[in-house]
């Protein structure tokens, strides 16, 4: 049932011991009760007791205070039960009877008689306070209380409401003394059978099934499954989205696992040789006279550098070497002569000048000639003077050195940033690469520069769905989406179950 | 959309040769650098080439060098590894892949992968 009308009786006196019809009951009056529950009557009529009806056994004898009693014969207050939303209003009809028989069942027995009867119309709410109430007539008087309650698990002002507590997959709730659920703690919902996961767990890419807990969606990791997990193989990148692999700075190739600064973190080259960060394995050397191999790890032999003079032939020996000296010269080097200018010893149109009394002399040596007798045409690359993969080109009398992209100065010793000098308009982003910088333009800008502004802006009519972002530039009228994770098409339209290795991401 | 479908993948006995095709849409194909990458089973991927936007900087893993060649056409947004003197060890699922930006570095958006077998 819904609830319970409860009738608590508390004393019953019948001084003289008589019964209604004016006879008195020998030796007293053996007394039970017949209680009759029914909607509510203007004018109480008899017929069936429409909420319920309960009789006492004997309770006592003409005058008796009734105790309290919760279980068996003689229940003190009756309970009569009722499975309907209870209307607010009922007539209660309490009779007092004698009976000489059973006093256990007296209900049965032939003989009864009216003591007698009391009749209560009105309307009672449902709670917990009882009503008391006292009823006297000429022979009688009747002390009772009376209650409206709802049984276990139906609430609410007519005990309509049903709730009972759970704490399984259903719900995980109490119940309000109005009947509405109170989630247990770490629930939530209608029903309080939604989890709240642990705070700060990620809207979309976490999820939980139980309170204070956060999984993580495919591609996403971290306790609060904020962190996108990078693609599988990525050394030294980060990514934005899922399975991304963004090159931190320095770092290059698909798996960012290319040293892009290979000279300054591994100083591979030896012997003062000068480290570019280029050529196939990420850098080159370039070596000092004297030195060779792919990092200048290798002395040439001592002769290298040619140092006999004077046509002198240069013969290795171990720690140094021996110039052997044409005739005429002299000396370690061949440089000390046994000719004058009488010999006419300066070759290529150089001027003879004598020396000690002209025992000796020196050549002077017309443009792009030199050596001890003007024997050597000039060649000024001879040294390697350009840095960083520079070329060196003889120019008449000087040397230039003609500078890879993204190398400056005399001998190509400055790198320069294509960046340095913003060569992107309208705020477009720079990114230098080996053969000049390459500019990512914002929305209504392009061009190699972004200096051409888009007169329709192709994303202006927000044509992307579900969050992505929308990029034009890449042709003038047309449009990019870049989808969020999840979602795929020309418009980031649908939906996708990513695979779970190599999912496409839009 | 970004798109990159790839093809040419197929058994092959070692030492011989086969040009892998990677197709292109969806994007202004001059923009990205465009590299192939390969998984085996049970291993981590290897990057094994990358072509600048340009098509003047061009690398390769250690393993592939002098041996597989990338290239690209612009006209037919396509890139192509050719693959000469293959060995069992190059057996694995190839992928083309670009980072969504001019230099090679890193990766952004790749295909479905195409399978190939070097085995006698």
């Known amino acids: 049932g819904s609830g319970i009308f409860q009738l608590r009786l508390q004393e019953f006196v019948n001084q003289r011991g008589m019964l209604a019809n004016g006879q008195s009951c020998e030796p007293g009056c053996r007394t039970f009760f017949r209680i009759c529950l029914k909607h509510f009557q203007a004018t109480f009529s008899e017929g069936p007791c429409t909420f319920g009806n309960v009789s006492t056994p004997v309770l006592g004898t003409n005058s008796f205070v009734v105790r309290d009693k919760n279980s068996g014969s003689g229940r003190n207050p009756l309970q009569l039960p009722f499975n309907f939303t209870w209307p607010g209003t009922f007539s209660l009809n309490i009779q007092a009877w004698h009976t000489p028989g059973d006093d256990l069942r007296p209900e049965t027995s032939p003989g009864n008689s009216l003591i007698s009867q009391i009749i209560i119309q009105g309307s009672l709410a449902v709670g917990k306070i009882w009503r008391t109430d006292e009823q006297n007539d000429t022979l009688t008087r009747l002390s009772y209380s009376y209650r409206v309650i709802c049984s276990d698990n139906y609430y609410g002002e007519s005990c309509s409401r049903l709730c009972k507590k759970r704490d399984d997959h259903f719900g995980h709730y109490e119940c309000q003394p109005d009947g509405s659920l109170s989630c247990l703690p770490g629930w939530t919902g209608k029903y309080c059978d939604q989890p709240i996961c642990l705070s700060g767990c990620h809207e979309q890419n976490g999820y939980c099934s139980k309170p204070d807990e956060c999984i993580c969606r495919p591609g996403w990791q971290g306790r609060l499954c904020n962190e996108c997990i990078p693609h599988n193989g990525c050394r030294h990148g980060t990514c934005s989205i899922p399975w991304q692999c963004a090159c931190d700075e320095g770092w290059g190739g698909l798996f960012c696992d290319q040293d892009l600064n290979y000279c300054t973190h591994h100083s591979p080259c030896k012997n003062g040789s000068t480290c570019s960060n280029s050529g196939p394995k990420g850098y080159t050397c370039t070596c000092l006279p004297g030195y060779t191999g792919e990092h200048c790890e290798l002395g040439l032999s001592k002769c290298a550098s040619n140092p006999c003079r004077n046509g002198g032939s240069c013969k290795d020996q171990e720690n140094s070497y021996h110039c052997l000296c044409p005739p005429g010269y002299y000396g370690q080097h061949c440089e000390h002569s046994t000719l004058t200018c009488a010999d006419s010893p300066c070759f290529n149109g150089g001027s003879c000048r004598e020396r000690n009394q002209g025992s000796s002399y020196a050549c002077e040596c017309p443009p792009n000639f030199t050596g001890s007798n003007c024997e050597k045409k000039v060649d000024r690359c001879t040294s390697n003077p350009c840095a960083n993969g520079g070329q060196c080109q003889n120019r008449g009398p000087s040397r230039t050195c003609r500078c890879r992209p993204g190398f400056t100065g005399t001998h190509c010793e400055l790198h320069i940033s294509d960046c340095a000098r913003s060569p992107c308009a309208h705020g477009g982003t720079c990114h230098d690469l080996e053969n000049g910088p390459v500019c990512t333009c914002p929305a209504g800008f392009s061009g190699r520069r972004c200096e051409v502004r888009i007169t329709h802006d192709a994303c202006a009519s927000g044509p992307c769905f579900n969050g992505a972002t929308c990029y034009t530039g890449l042709s003038p009228n047309n449009f990019v989406c870049n989808c969020p994770y999840g979602f795929v098409g020309s418009r980031c339209e649908f939906p996708v179950g990513l695979p779970p290795s190599f999912p496409w991401v839009a | 959309e970004v798109q990159l479908v790839e093809s040419g993948g197929g058994l092959v006995q070692p030492g011989g040769s086969l040009r892998l095709s990677c197709t292109a849409s969806?994007?202004?194909?001059?923009?990205?650098?465009i590299g192939w990458f390969r998984q085996a089973p049970g291993k981590e991927p290897e990057g094994i080439s990358c072509i600048s936007s340009s098509g003047s900087i061009t690398y390769y893993a250690d393993s592939v060098k002098g041996r597989f060649t990338t290239s690209r056409d612009s006209a037919k947004n396509t890139v192509y590894l050719q693959m000469n003197s293959l060995k069992p060890e190059d057996t694995a699922v190839y992928y083309c892949?670009?980072?969504?930006?001019?230099?090679?570095?890193?990766?952004?958006?790749w295909g479905q992968g195409t399978q190939v077998t070097v085995s006698s």
């Open positions: 892949a670009t980072p969504g930006i001019a230099a090679c570095r890193g990766i952004h958006y």
């Open positions: 969806g994007f202004t194909f001059d923009v990205y650098a």
